[in-house]
């Protein structure tokens, strides 16, 4: 069987400051088994922004039902944007492990871009 | 603190049908997941079926066709319509919460069916 | 489909530690959990996603992986363990729920 992917395919997205940033992301399979984290920027730094495991993540609502079985649409929404969250977004797939689960594939990074309001 | 009990239990004859409930508080109801899950008298736990919290919904395969698992979410019911039952369907029915992954983590003190002649 | 073997039934003194195994499935498919059940009782989830305890159980429960094998550790048994335990799993491949045939422990 195909090895999973993760697909992220928009390279930018620029929203307005107050409005609402779609970041879409699918994956190519359902095996390993294992949760979608994303984050904002890459390397030991980088800021967890919504985790399909556990957390309270109130900015950010999933595009599609996560409890489906079949589901591999991980896209988020992250509403009332503000410059502070402009940078560079990665889906990153883990698969399970014990104690912690490990990094298995990420996506190739959308760039978030924020337009100030006019004033 | 999360809580499921189940109702609509009850003896029935072989054919006939039954609706059990799951009224479901302590929780966001409408967020998660859920399965119903039964134990035949004096066996193991038997997977029946569960369902998304957007509806989507699977089926153990000795009750495809026959039982349908459904829910509403602004009532915080989870429902299972049982048809056509036979002898095998007795059992306590267990509706249980899913975990992101799809285990259980809260299960219902459980609701007897028996199908007799 | 897949099948999830345990033992029947396992047997432990007070203060001892228990062990019930379960094997069956794909280590990269298949989440796992433990689940325990008292007589005339509900069951009550001990252990999912293969390790993670929930905050109400005792610590004296712990899960571990290896391969195809799954196993349910209870350090320092007590009378109150005593109990069917059924293993269970979720594959990601099928979407199926699977139960083992479920473990008696009998405190002696």
């Known amino acids: 069987e195909e090895e999973l992917q993760v697909i992220q395919p928009d390279k930018s997205v620029l929203v307005a400051a107050g409005e609402t940033a779609t970041l879409r992301c699918t994956a190519t399979s359902l095996i390993p088994v294992g949760p979608i984290q994303w984050f904002r920027g890459a390397g030991p730094g980088r800021e967890l922004i919504y985790n399909q495991k556990e957390g309270h993540f109130p900015r950010v609502t999933t595009v599609s039902d996560l409890t489906k079985r079949n589901n591999m649409d991980f896209s988020i929404r992250i509403g009332n944007i503000t410059p502070a969250d402009a940078g560079t977004y990665y889906c990153v797939k883990f698969r399970k492990g014990s104690p912690d689960d490990v990094e298995f594939k990420s996506g190739a990074g959308t760039e978030l871009s924020v337009r100030a309001k006019p004033s | 603190d999360v809580q499921l009990v189940e109702s609509g239990g009850g003896v029935v004859r072989p054919g006939e049908s039954l609706r059990l409930s799951c009224e479901a508080s302590?929780?966001?109801?409408?967020?998660?997941?859920m399965s119903w899950v039964r134990q035949a008298p004096g066996k193991g736990l038997e997977w029946v079926a569960g369902?998304?919290?957007?509806?989507?919904?699977y089926y153990g395969d000795s009750v495809k066709g026959r039982l349908t698992i459904s829910r509403d979410n602004s009532k915080n019911i989870l429902y299972l319509q049982m048809n056509s039952l036979t002898a095998e369907d007795t059992a306590v029915y267990y509706c249980a919460r899913e975990t992101w992954n799809h285990l259980f983590d809260y299960w219902g003190l459980g609701t007897l069916v028996t199908v007799s002649s | 489909s897949y099948e999830l073997t345990q033992p029947p039934s396992v047997s432990v003194s007070p203060g001892q530690t228990a062990r019930i195994t379960c094997s069956g499935g794909?280590?990269?498919?298949?989440?796992y959990a433990w689940y325990q059940q008292k007589p005339g009782q509900a069951p009550v989830t001990v252990i999912h996603s293969d390790d993670k305890r929930p905050s109400d159980i005792p610590e004296r429960f712990s899960g571990s992986s290896s391969g195809t094998t799954v196993t349910l550790t209870i350090s320092g048994v007590q009378a109150e363990d005593e109990a069917d335990y059924y293993c269970?799993?979720?594959?990601?491949?099928?979407?199926?729920?699977?139960f083992g045939g479920g473990t008696k422990l009998t405190v002696l």
């Open positions: 302590g929780f966001t109801f409408s967020s998660n997941a």
């Open positions: 794909d280590y990269y498919s298949t989440y």
């Open positions: 269970g799993g979720y594959d990601g491949r099928t979407y199926i729920n699977t």
């Open positions: 369902i998304s919290s957007g509806s989507d919904t």
